[in-house]
């Protein structure tokens, strides 16, 4: 048979061109990409490949070593001068490792038939590649009809005798894919039908999307799908200390590329993202929610001595409302309002003040008015009670003024203006207020209500009474109006500084109507209700003193 070098003997050694070719070619063989997993690489097998040639005088292995003395497994065949060639080379069993689509990369050289004298009728420039699926590692079968053809392989570039002389080796690389595979493994077969071929390397691999961490989600090594257009949806798992609202997913393409990310993981509260991992917030820092990017310093007047803090603790005498966000500074109650002034108008008081010097760090300052009625003699104060009205209101005042109406006249009051804010109710400290003492103006007194009859004679009636419930000032005098019953238009008026009088010059056995009113500097009050008393008959004795009902 013809040798590849063009001599017609059958050399047992590798011809020169093979050495030249391999030394050049092997230097160019690079490591496989990270998304390719080799099932077989003839270049890396140290011992016997365990391949079978059939018939035995067809394909032959050329034992060579590279510059590092590693064996090179090269198979060649060059029976271009003989008719009806059918030379088969069968690989050992190759596990597909769960892949349903595999790729076969062939590196080979092929002699140009035109450069071979006398072999034009029988010389071929192609060879065929087949596969046979099997679960059995020992099931190598050489029945040709059981093998499925993958493709006819032609060279992009063939070489001539001239190339040999110039030592220019034209190494072809062809890749074919096979799938879907359904069994645990397979055999490959190379059929020569009369070409001059050197099969330099066979690499069988599958593609995977390599494990990756993206958006804090770990996506595992994923073998690509059987279909070349298929996108496999892969669920990611969140890295330590991370959580997700939307489970992370990515799609693994047939080319072993990750595409179309959906969802993401976020570092949980108390952790932040650094270099694709979730790192703990250090003491002094916190992160309240997964949705916040990074740990932040504790806000003013707060601290944390923990790692992984989700909030900070308020310093002594500082507080945080439940509704305050954890990013807000801790705050304290305000100081007292300042410069309170009052303006009295009869039984109304208008108070005005300026805000506290220290609002406690809050904007929600409001004011509360406490009203106390004080006894000027005893110095004892009591709550004012419900009759006092506050305009616009008693508590929750936003403005720095208030009007109190319906106060008692000529009464000592103490008003406490307290500043409060959102944390005042959380503080055990003393109330912060400013006090204002006022005395309301005198007003007309209330009616006299309690009148007693004294000595009653035939021509006179003596009366006594108590000061009105609400004198509304200093009582200057009383005015007593009386008339004979049913003769209202003819009345008499007596004035008295005391709470007793005697009406004289009355008719015996007659009924008289009395009304009394008091006067202060502010004027007269209204008359009391009518009180009726009867003088005695001419011969009767004086009556005893008794209270009129």
């Amino acid at each position: 048979p013809a040798s590849l070098a063009g001599c017609y003997s059958a050399p047992r050694r590798a011809p020169l061109w093979t050495c030249l070719l391999l030394c050049a070619a092997l230097r160019t063989l690079l490591a496989s990409p990270s998304n390719e997993v080799n099932l077989l690489d003839s270049r890396t097998v140290m011992g016997d490949l365990g391949w079978i040639a059939f018939p035995k005088n067809g394909w032959e292995e050329i034992g060579e070593v590279d510059e590092n003395y590693a064996p090179i497994h090269t198979y060649q065949v060059c029976k271009v001068m003989e008719q009806n060639q059918n030379n088969w080379l069968l690989t050992s069993w190759i596990s597909n490792e769960g892949a349903s689509r595999i790729f076969i990369e062939l590196k080979f050289t092929l002699r140009d038939c035109n450069s071979l004298p006398g072999g034009l009728g029988t010389c071929k420039e192609t060879f065929n590649m087949y596969y046979f699926e099997s679960d059995d590692q020992n099931g190598r079968n050489i029945k040709e009809n059981q093998y499925i053809k993958i493709d006819t392989i032609a060279a992009d570039e063939s070489f001539t005798e001239l190339d040999l002389g110039d030592r220019v080796m034209k190494l072809n690389t062809e890749v074919r894919d096979v799938g879907p595979l359904s069994k645990k493994g397979f055999y490959l077969a190379f059929q020569d039908v009369g070409a001059c071929i050197a099969l330099v390397s066979v690499r069988v691999y599958y593609k995977k999307c390599p494990s990756v961490v993206r958006h804090l989600a770990v996506f595992p090594d994923t073998i690509t799908g059987a279909d070349s257009s298929q996108l496999l949806e892969v669920s990611g798992s969140c890295v330590n200390h991370s959580v997700t609202d939307e489970p992370p997913k990515m799609h693994c393409s047939a080319e072993g590329e990750w595409l179309v990310p959906i969802g993401k993981c976020m570092c949980k509260a108390g952790y932040e993202e650094k270099n694709g991992t979730c790192q703990v917030c250090r003491p002094g820092f916190f992160k309240a929610s997964p949705h916040i990017q990074s740990c932040g310093k504790c806000p003013p007047h707060s601290y944390t001595h923990e790692e992984a803090s989700t909030s900070c603790v308020c310093e002594k005498d500082y507080f945080r409302r439940e509704s305050d966000p954890p990013t807000m500074a801790c705050t304290r109650p305000p100081s007292a309002p300042r410069n309170a002034i009052s303006n009295v108008n009869e039984t109304s008081v208008f108070l005005e003040w300026i805000p506290p010097a220290d609002t406690g760090g809050r904007k929600d300052v409001s004011y509360y008015i406490a009203c106390k009625k004080c006894n000027s003699h005893a110095g004892v104060c009591e709550e004012c009670g419900g009759h006092v009205r506050y305009l616009p209101r008693q508590s929750g005042l936003k403005n720095t003024s208030v009007m109190m109406v319906d106060l008692l006249a000529h009464t000592n009051y103490t008003f406490e203006i307290e500043a409060v804010n959102g944390v005042s109710d959380l503080s055990p400290g003393a109330r912060q207020y400013v006090s204002v003492n006022v005395t309301t103006n005198q007003a007309a007194p209330s009616p006299v209500t309690n009148v007693k009859k004294g000595k009653i004679a035939k021509n006179s009636i003596s009366l006594s009474w108590q000061e009105p419930d609400r004198p509304n000032g200093i009582i200057l005098e009383y005015e007593i109006k009386y008339f004979e019953k049913d003769q209202e238009t003819s009345y008499t008026i007596i004035k008295s500084k005391e709470t007793t009088i005697t009406a004289e010059g009355l008719k015996p056995a007659s009924v008289y109507v009395f009304q009394i009113r008091a006067r202060t500097a502010a004027g007269y009050g209204v008359f009391s209700r009518r009180f009726e008393f009867e003088t005695t008959p001419v011969f009767a004795a004086s009556s005893d003193q008794s209270q009129i009902p």
Partner: antibody, heavy 120, light 111 residues
Framework: EVTLVESGGGLVQPGGSRKLSCAAS????????IHWVRQAPGKGLEWVAY????????YYADTVKGRFTISRDNSKNTLYLQMNSLRSEDTAMYYC?????????????WGQGTSVTVSS | DIVMTQSPGSLAVSLGQRATISCKAS??????????MNWYQQKPGQPPKLLIY???NLESGIPARFSGSGSGTDFTLNIHPVEEEDAASYYC?????????FGSGTKLEIK
């Protein structure tokens, strides 16, 4: 008023054990990290261990790691340092100190210390 | 571990003059814009007292004649004007990284 009072010191044989206590008052103990710091006679300060208020964060100096254990009982306002496999080089005045609240935190209050002597 | 190298080991300063103590960290003690460097004063028979935290912040109740400066690896404690009561040992400490190491100390004597 913030006070820290250490106790439990004394003479211990090499290889022996001792448990130090630190009683705290005048502040909300459970929210404060506390440190143990020691000082060998005539020498400088050496940081020993730290525990956060909720005991979630604990650190040790390399020289005591595996031999000393820091712990606390917030219900008793007390910090502890369990010292095992004691060596002569552990002889020192042991102070407990409170982590401060002004950032970045220093050790703002210290106890008066308790003396531990490791000798045969 | 971060090693804190303090210098000088001791110094004598006249009353009213300036005392300067240096502390050098074997690696930066800064984090997020803050320097985790503290200074303490210790008098014989007493526990240490915090003077400066965060390299330059004066602890409450400490006289303003104490000041701290520096960032990264180089820090300084200044006392000016020095008073009689300032005679003590001074220690720097980093709290950026566990273990929280102290410097070897500087003994200040008043002349």
């Amino acid at each position: 008023e913030v006070t820290l009072v250490e106790s439990g010191g004394g003479l211990v044989q090499p290889g022996g054990s001792r448990k130090l206590s630190c009683a705290a008052s005048g502040f909300t103990f459970s929210t404060f990290g506390i440190h143990w710091v020691r000082q060998a006679p005539g020498k400088g300060l050496e940081w020993v261990a730290y525990i956060s208020g909720a005991s979630t964060t604990i650190y040790y100096a390399d020289t005591v790691k595996g031999r000393f254990t820091i712990s606390r009982d917030n219900s008793k306002n007390t910090l502890y340092l369990q010292m095992n496999s004691l060596r002569s080089e552990d002889t020192a005045m042991y102070y407990c100190a409170r982590y401060g609240t002004s950032f970045p935190y220093g050790l703002d209050y210290w106890g008066q210390g308790t003396s531990v002597t490791v000798s045969s | 571990d971060i090693v804190m190298t303090q210098s000088p080991g001791s110094l004598a300063v006249s009353l009213g003059q300036r005392a300067t103590i240096s502390c050098k960290a074997s690696q930066s003690v800064d984090y997020d814009g803050d320097s985790y460097m503290n200074w303490y004063q210790q008098k014989p028979g007493q526990p240490p007292k915090l003077l400066i935290y965060g390299a330059s912040n004066l602890e409450s109740g400490i006289p303003a004649r104490f000041s701290g400066s520096g960032s990264g690896t180089d820090f300084t404690l200044n006392i000016h004007p020095v008073e009689e009561e300032d005679a003590a040992s001074y220690y720097c400490q980093q709290s950026n990284e566990d273990p929280f190491t102290f410097g070897s100390g500087t003994k200040l004597e008043i002349k």
